[in-house]
């Protein structure tokens, strides 16, 4: 006879799994808010700043009520990957003005990366279909000026803040339905 069977694989408690993801998301949300406030203090900027390469915001009126877990996690992962790429780009090409936001931008990048790995783990633990590998994204053009880099930073941090809020609200709402 072969070796005795191993212990049965414990299926994860989806609420606990979601919980730890929400925790990381909330923590990153607080970091992002703080960094955005720091940026506003150093480089005040009026009005909304947009960057065409950023993902469009995930939520529209009424959409939260119809959310399903696979859709939320897939969309969130795709959007956060884009933000990670933009934060990396900002650190590399943002110019000397944005060096004043280090080491905080570096910490934000590391935490964003950690949340992405956590989402990947959650999706595999919950046996959700894995999204296909992302096609290589075209490189982001360097900002045209120092002020262009600052405007981009406002857009990136503002968009990330809203995306993380959408994520926390969506994930907590889904948790109530589990």
């Amino acid at each position: 006879p072969g070796p005795p069977p191993g212990p049965p694989r414990v299926s994860p408690d989806p609420r606990a799994e979601l919980d730890s993801t929400v925790l990381l998301t909330r923590s990153l949300l607080a970091d992002t808010r703080q960094l955005a406030a720091q940026l506003r203090d150093k480089f005040p900027a009026d009005g909304d700043h947009n960057l065409d390469s950023l993902p469009t915001l995930a939520m529209s009126a009424g959409a939260l009520g119809a959310l399903q877990l696979p859709g939320v996690l897939t969309r969130l992962r795709a959007d956060l990957l884009s933000y990670l790429r933009h934060v990396q780009w900002l650190r590399r090409a943002g110019g000397s003005s944005l060096k004043t936001l280090e080491p905080e931008l570096g910490t934000l990048q590391a935490r964003l990366d950690r949340l992405l790995r956590r989402l990947q783990l959650l999706m595999s633990r919950l046996a959700l279909p894995q999204p296909p590998p992302d096609p290589p994204a075209p490189p982001l053009a360097p900002p045209s000026s120092a002020w262009g880099g600052i405007r981009a930073a406002h857009a990136i941090l503002g968009g990330l803040h809203l995306t993380l809020d959408w994520a926390v609200r969506g994930l907590l709402l889904l948790k109530t339905r589990l």
């Epitope: 919980d19 925790l23 998301t25 909330r26 923590s27 949300l29 607080a30 808010r33 909304d48 915001l57 995930a58 939520m59 529209s60 009126a61 009424g62 959409a63 939260l64 803040h161 809203l162 993380l164 809020d165 959408w166 926390v168 609200r169 907590l172 709402l173 948790k175 109530t176």
Partner: antibody, heavy 119, light 111 residues
């Protein structure tokens, strides 16, 4: 000065609807969520739901799902709460409150709108 | 939903005394480093006012005599030396999960 100013008191019949407004000033309207809280006489405060003014997506306490509708007019920096199929238990003071994104604590409150439901 | 129980229901103290208000949650509202409990003060005919957020952070414009502490399921609001204007009703609120809920309140009265 950061302020939330709500519409005036309302008296409604059972089965009717009421729509309360909340005008924000002194801050960037889209930087915070707008939450709504009910305070009925002798009852604890009750969270109704919130809305993200930037994206317009509301979420509700299950207790109020289907009867409360939260909307915003970004251009007017105004949030609205409509409550339908009113009953006597809806008699309360309703507050709008500015909510920190993702954390649900409320650092600025409107003055409250009294809604009385009576036949 | 998480239930918050405040004690005592009412408390009579004199100006200058120390007030200790308690809030107990039906399950833990803390997760590594964050405690999702907030405290408000409400006076008759007025809206609530945020005093403390995330268990121990003083809200803007709130006097330093107010402080918050605790983790897990047990939290405390302390007023180190009561002033006349502190006599009011105090509520705790959690935001650990949806929906956020409030305690039933502690009424602080002048002795």
């Amino acid at each position: 000065e950061v302020q939330l100013v709500q519409s005036g008191a309302e008296v409604k019949k059972p089965g009717a609807s009421v729509k309360i407004s909340c005008k924000a000033s002194g801050y960037t309207f889209t930087d915070y969520n707008m939450d709504w809280v009910k305070q009925a006489p002798g009852q604890r405060l009750e969270w109704i739901g919130d809305i993200n003014p930037h994206q317009g997506g509301p979420i509700y306490n299950q207790k109020f799902t289907g009867r409360a509708t939260l909307t915003v007019d970004k251009s007017a920096s105004t949030a609205y709460m409509e409550l339908s199929s009113l009953r006597s238990e809806d008699t309360a003071v309703y507050y709008c409150a500015r909510g920190e994104l993702g954390h649900w604590y409320f650092d600025v409150w409107g003055q409250g709108t009294t809604v009385t439901v009576s036949s | 939903d998480i239930v918050l129980t405040q004690s005592p229901a009412s408390l009579a103290l004199s100006p200058g005394e120390r007030a200790t208000l308690s809030c107990r949650a039906s399950k833990s509202v803390s997760t590594s480093g964050y405690s999702y409990i907030h405290w408000y003060q409400q006076k008759p005919g007025q809206a609530p006012r945020l005093l403390i957020y995330l268990a121990s952070n003083l809200a803007s414009g709130v006097p330093a005599r107010f402080s918050g502490s605790g983790s897990g399921t047990d939290f405390t609001l302390t007023i180190s030396s009561l002033e006349e204007e502190d006599f009011a009703t105090y509520y705790c609120q959690h935001s650990r999960d949806l929906p956020p809920t409030f305690g039933q309140g502690t009424k602080l009265e002048i002795k």
